[in-house]
Interface confidence: low
């Protein structure tokens, strides 16, 4: 966030940088002396460093130019007084920090830092073997038959010559299974049983552990070599092969380190190789026993129309746009191809029906005309464009279509089984004549369209994938009696036990993704955080945590007040809202440091020029950013004036709110997303907006456009009321 400081700038120097840094560069060997680049042997965690809690742990530092140089030295252990298991490259100071430990070691913790990249030697974190397991450096210490291993440095009960000092680099540590000579059976050890001298350990092959569904587009495993054994090139490197698959350009493709991936609809995962003569090769990843797509990966199946790019289209149209018939997918005539049903098992390549197995812009097929290889089936209508009863007017309270599926593909459950729940959140008798079967309806006057109950206890109800009819301009917020509703509830400054709550920012949440701050959020209820859709790059909720009660993004100095909570569910906002309600695994404990923030009245209007603030730990424009929460002061701007400031290129609607900076060049930026626009009315602070990716960071004269919380207030209340929350 480009901002004024909220707190004094205490530069908390990085623990590891207190060491004396010698500005000596490692020469990079050229010509015949050029060594192989070993950075592909490391797992990278961007913007992360390791902090030693145990002061006895040693580290070594040196000035260098690139992370590749750090990696080569770590791999060779040259000049290091320990076995290097990981290193951090400090991009700002062009410096290596080599470690004899990694993030799994005791006495160490991970910490976020923009200028740091952590690289951990994969051999020390891998729990499977490649080939004979010569490079295995994991911590299994039990043999195949369950006998505990004898330590390598011990001669009891078995004398031997496999001394750690004789096998440098083979990591004969503790009593871990190893294969120092690369013998056929794989890693082994001397056993602690005097009757059994040695035995192999039952460590699986990585190719056995790894499996994929369908053609592996959603595969995010750790296979890092091809089917012929070639090591994969890192996706963030352009040598030896230049390519377009840059991790930062395709953040959703899982381009981590040098792992096999399928970003482009190939039959199975592949990678570029480190062999200059072999640009790319497929990887040997077996198909999972249950070869079906995860629910989360299934595109919404349609038969009559195209949703999105039509990857879920399962209809029977079998001609391209101009009527030329399609070639059968299992035929190689007139066009040879590898888009066969065998190669693309989950893509329903039946007969000669139009399909989109490779992520093209819409369904297509090979044609039966020898002169026209492929064509798009663009005559299939788009689901969003369908007319008649498949669209609704206003907020859809009169919708009488017969769609009975939610936007996530769940089948609606019967209205008559859910009347009790419905009565719980509406205060009038619903029109039973409209609530027939399990069709999508809007009995509670929901501003965001028809919805239905589901049979899934985790998702009690959801919206249906129906759009407003084209050209319908009926406002969804209708306030005839009160043309201007105040945003604040009528109550004045809140008082708890007779003492006004301190005007802190205890509702501010740091959403963590894989141990790093990724977004802001607002605690609106003990178990609920309001944030933005763009904050969730992974579908795995184990990747996320919510930190509450902190001022420092790293939690430094906040130990007494910090609460760390897991995330149990994400509830996505109405279509196009960019909002997410994040359910916490247990309720936050409200205290002096953690509090909730109020929501505005539904459909309210806040006067122009009202002074508001945005808060965040995001991009600040400072390389030595101190990690403290920042604030930028903005003022509310009317939608028309806002549009003018955006040179007429932006038309704001009722779901957006605009605020301009008091100090030019301040405003929200990356890392602030999900955080709140907070305004005060009648001495009450409310979250009136949510920061979502906009049009550049704090661009002078370009006010920020936020999601208008007042427009979604009823949805938020409805979720809080209807979704089950854990008890503390």
């Amino acid at each position: 966030m480009w901002v004024t400081k909220l707190l004094p700038a205490l530069l908390l120097q990085h623990v590891l940088l207190h060491l004396l840094l010698l500005p000596i560069a490692i020469p990079y060997a050229e010509g015949q002396r050029k060594r192989r680049n070993t950075i592909h042997e490391f797992k990278k965690s961007a913007k992360t460093t390791l902090i030693k809690i145990d002061p006895a742990l040693k580290i070594k530092t040196k000035k260098v130019n690139t992370a590749d140089q750090c990696a080569n030295r770590c791999t060779r252990n040259k000049g290091l007084p320990f076995t290097c298991k990981a290193f951090v490259f400090d991009k700002a100071r062009k410096q290596c920090l080599w470690f004899p430990f990694n993030s799994m070691s005791s006495g160490v913790k991970k910490e976020f830092g923009h200028e740091f990249d952590l690289y951990e030697n994969k051999d020390y974190i891998r729990n499977c073997i490649i080939g004979k397991g010569r490079s295995y450096k994991g911590t299994v210490s039990i043999t195949k038959s369950g006998i505990k291993c004898q330590p390598w440095s011990s001669m009891i009960p078995h004398e031997h010559s496999f001394l750690p000092s004789s096998y440098r680099g083979k990591d004969l540590q503790e009593n871990y299974c190893r294969n120092p000579r690369g013998e056929e059976g794989g890693p082994w050890c001397f056993t602690s049983n005097p009757e059994v001298r040695y035995e192999v350990c039952d460590i699986p092959q990585c190719s056995e552990v790894e499996c994929m569904t369908c053609n592996g587009e959603s595969y995010r495993g750790l296979m890092d070599h091809t089917e012929s054994g070639k090591i994969c090139q890192r996706w963030d490197h352009q040598t030896p092969h230049r390519h377009k698959f840059l991790p930062e350009r395709y953040p959703d493709k899982g381009f981590d380190d040098n792992y096999c991936r399928n970003p482009d609809g190939q039959p199975r995962p592949w990678c570029y190789t480190l062999d200059p003569h072999t640009r790319w090769e497929y990887c040997a990843i077996k198909t999972c026993a249950d070869n079906t797509m995860n629910d989360t990966d299934v595109p919404l199946e349609t038969t009559e129309c195209i949703q999105g790019q039509g990857e879920g289209y399962r209809g029977t149209v079998n001609t391209i746009w101009n009527g030329i018939p399609c070639q059968r997918w299992d035929s190689q005539y007139p066009h040879e191809h590898d888009m066969t049903p065998e190669n693309f098992k989950c893509k329903d390549l039946r007969e000669n029906y139009c399909r989109n197995p490779d992520g093209s812009e819409s369904p297509w097929c090979f044609t039966t005309d020898p002169n026209i290889r492929v064509g798009y089936c663009s005559q299939i209508p788009n689901c969003d464009m369908s007319h008649g009863q498949d669209c609704y007017r206003g907020n859809g309270k009169n919708y009488m279509g017969n769609l009975s599926q939610t936007r996530s593909g769940l089948t609606c459950s019967m209205w008559d089984k859910n009347m009790e729940d419905l009565h719980r959140h509406i205060f009038w008798e619903p029109d039973a004549s409209k609530l027939n079967e399990n069709y999508c309806r809007n009995p509670d006057d929901d501003a965001h369209g028809p919805w239905c109950y589901t049979g899934n206890p985790l998702i009690p109800w959801d919206y249906c994938p129906i759009s407003r009819c084209e050209g319908d301009t009926t406002p969804t917020i209708v306030n005839l009696d009160h043309p201007v509703i105040s945003c604040a509830k009528t109550k004045q400054l809140r008082v708890v036990n007779g003492i006004p709550t301190r005007t802190n920012i205890g509702w501010m949440v740091s959403l963590r993704y894989r141990n790093k701050h990724i977004c802001g959020g607002s605690l609106i209820k003990e178990s609920w955080v309001l944030t933005a859709r763009q904050c969730f790059p992974s579908r795995d909720l184990k990747d996320y945590e919510a930190w509450l009660g902190i001022h420092d993004v790293h939690g430094r100095g906040d130990e007494k007040c910090k609460q760390v909570l897991n995330v149990s569910q994400l509830v996505y906002g109405p279509e196009g809202s960019d909002l997410v309600l994040m359910k916490l695994a247990r309720p936050a404990v409200l205290d002096d440091f953690v509090s909730t923030i109020d929501l505005p009245n539904y459909g309210c209007t806040i006067p122009e020029k009202t002074s508001c603030s945005v808060y965040g730990w995001g991009y600040t424009g400072l390389i030595n950013y101190d990690g403290l929460l920042r604030v930028a002061h903005l003022y509310i701007m009317g939608n028309e004036k806002c549009s003018q400031h955006h040179r007429g290129k932006v038309t704001l609607n009722e779901s957006e709110i605009c605020a301009g900076a008091e100090k030019i060049g301040s405003g929200p930026c990356e890392g602030d997303y999900g955080g709140p626009l907070v305004c005060e009315q009648h001495k009450m602070r409310m979250v009136l907006g949510v920061i979502v990716p906009g049009r550049g960071c704090a661009i002078p004269n370009r006010p920020g456009i936020f999601v208008r919380v007042a427009y979604y207030a009823k949805w938020i209340h409805k979720i809080i009321l209807t979704y089950k929350v854990p008890q503390s």
Epitope: W2, K91, A92, R93, G621, N624, C697, A698, I699
Partner: antibody
């Protein structure tokens, strides 16, 4: 070899406009924050504007805010400075500058162009 | 805004001598300071970054020291090619500001 070549300077009336360009070569332009720095006839150096590597963030000191606009075309490896409502105190040698690469761009200015002279006559 | 005060404004010295130029920041800028050298008719060149680090190609007779608010640039055994102007600059957030400069002349 890193090269920054400015152009577009000249004599302009007070209140007039001018657009400076800077052609960059010898490095991956799109990876670096870029700045314009000017040197007054009294030899004082003043930072005028910067732009982030992708062009999403720009920043100016109060003395030029609202009058100068920095922009870049990464496809053409070119940096621009559009100057309007020029004043006599804007008379200076204008340098195109590369900032050392870093996540935030708040780094020392490691390469400077040869400069282009702007004279504003009243 | 952070003010950078450089002293002395000018200095007249002989070849072979050692000189020290100082720069004071109006608030703590940690080690976010650079020194530049400008020869007559040329553009400035980076001499020191991060207060103490020399870029490749800068002779070792130049050295930077200091952190926080007090910084200095030392030139040992002055050579004829070292004459010109020297500027300090902070990059602890915007606006970046430069010192007023120190003009080094041959005695």
């Amino acid at each position: 070899e890193v090269q920054l070549v400015e152009s577009g300077g000249g004599l302009v009336q007070s209140g007039g406009s001018l657009k400076l360009s800077c052609a960059a070569s010898g490095f991956t332009f799109s990876n670096y924050f870029m700045s314009w720095v000017r040197q007054t006839p009294e030899k004082r150096l003043e930072w005028v504007a910067y732009i982030s590597s992708g062009g999403g963030s720009t920043y100016y000191p109060d003395s030029v805010k609202g009058r100068f606009t920095i922009s870049r075309d990464n496809a053409k490896n070119t940096l621009y400075l559009q100057m309007s409502s020029l004043k006599s105190e804007d008379t200076a040698m204008y340098y195109c500058v590369r900032q050392g690469d870093g996540y935030y761009g708040d780094y020392a200015m490691d390469y400077w162009g040869q400069g282009t002279s702007v004279t504003v006559s009243s | 805004d952070i003010q950078m005060t450089q002293s002395p404004a000018s200095l007249s010295v002989s070849v072979g001598e050692t000189v020290t130029i100082t720069c004071r920041a109006s608030e703590n800028i940690y080690s976010n300071l650079a020194w530049y050298q400008q020869k007559q008719g040329k553009s400035p060149q980076l001499l020191v970054y991060d207060a103490t680090h020399l870029p490749d190609g800068v002779p070792s007779r130049f050295s930077g020291s200091g952190s926080g608010t007090q910084f200095s640039l030392k030139i040992n055994s002055l050579q004829s090619e070292d004459f010109g102007s020297y500027y300090c600059q902070h990059f602890w957030g915007t606006p970046y500001t430069f010192g007023g400069g120190t003009r080094l002349e041959i005695k």
